[in-house]
């Protein structure tokens, strides 16, 4: 015998109190699959969370974060404070990157400047709190008689502060 509830489409639930008739989900609830015996309560995007997509009878609401915060976790279950470039988020809030480290984003941690000397390069542009160093040609390339200048190498694994 087929379960009569299996005929209830998404957006409805199988109402045991009414002879297993398919009833529409009540306001502020949804069912995303057929054959459901209950509808789920819609997520509310409160406070720091803002509504990215309204709840419908067949799908939950989706939230993101108000400006100054960014989403973390599955389905934006958390909103984390942004910092400025050149800072990282610590237990005590946003703190400037220590000398020799940088962060070019509003989230994440400060990373050490690239150590150009590990690649046999020189420092072309000094690093800041917001930007990594730019490595230039190796000292040998700059000696008289060198025919061409090597273009700056892309930043490699972060190393220690440049000498």
């Amino acid at each position: 015998l087929q379960d009569p509830c299996s005929n209830c489409p998404a957006g409805t639930f199988c109402d045991n109190n009414r002879n297993q008739i398919c009833s529409p989900c009540p306001p502020n609830s949804f069912s995303s699959a057929g054959g459901q015996r209950t509808c789920d309560i819609c997520r509310q995007c409160k406070g720091v969370f803002r509504t990215r997509k309204e709840c419908s009878s067949t799908s939950n609401a989706e939230c993101d974060c108000t400006p100054g915060f960014h989403c973390l976790g599955a389905g934006c279950s958390m909103c984390e404070q942004d910092c400025k470039q050149g800072q990282e988020l610590t237990k005590k809030g946003c703190k400037d990157c220590c000398f020799g480290t940088f962060n070019d984003q509003k989230r994440g941690i400060c990373r050490p400047w690239t150590n150009c000397s590990l690649d046999g390069k020189s420092v072309l542009v000094n690093g800041t709190k917001e930007r990594d160093v730019v490595c230039g040609p190796s000292p040998a390339d700059l000696s008289p008689g060198a025919s061409s200048v090597t273009p700056p190498a892309p930043a490699r694994e972060p190393g220690h502060s440049p000498q």
Partner: nanobody, 121 residues
Framework: QVQLQESGGGLVQVGGSLRLSCAAS????????IGWFRQAPGKEREGVLC????????YYADSVKGRFTISRDNAKNTVYLQMTNLKPEDTAVYLC??????????????WGQGTQVTVSS
């Protein structure tokens, strides 16, 4: 049950002051931070100020530095937002929330309904 209730809003002249309160009940107040947010008509909600469970302040909005301060009275389960030198752009509904940590809010955190602040010139 858990409740956050804002009060102290109202109409004030430019340059005036107001003190908003966020009174909490139904949870262990001392374990939670309290953050203030505001939403002006037709604008995005923005963070204002937050106080950690230990009493440290975090400014979310640079525009209120030097004008707004935050404090808490754990004996009264209340956080106060002292607003001075108010400007027309401070007009908004102010609401408080109770995260564990000022830097991170969860979808199950508690929130109040808000109190209206209107600054008239």
């Amino acid at each position: 049950q858990v409740q956050l209730q804002e009060s102290g809003g109202g109409l004030v002249q430019v340059g005036g002051s107001l003190r908003l309160s966020c009174a909490a009940s139904g949870f262990t107040f001392d374990d939670y931070a309290i953050g203030w947010f505001r939403q002006a008509p037709g604008k995005e909600r923005e963070g204002v100020l937050c106080i950690s469970s230990s009493g440290g302040s975090t400014y979310y909005a640079d525009s209120v530095k030097g004008r707004f301060t935050i404090s808490r009275d754990n004996a009264k389960n209340t956080v106060y937002l002292q607003m001075t030198n108010l400007k027309p752009e401070d007009t908004a509904v102010y609401l408080c929330g109770a995260p564990r940590d000022c830097s991170r809010y969860s979808s199950d955190d508690y929130w109040g309904q808000g109190t209206q602040v209107t600054v008239s010139s």
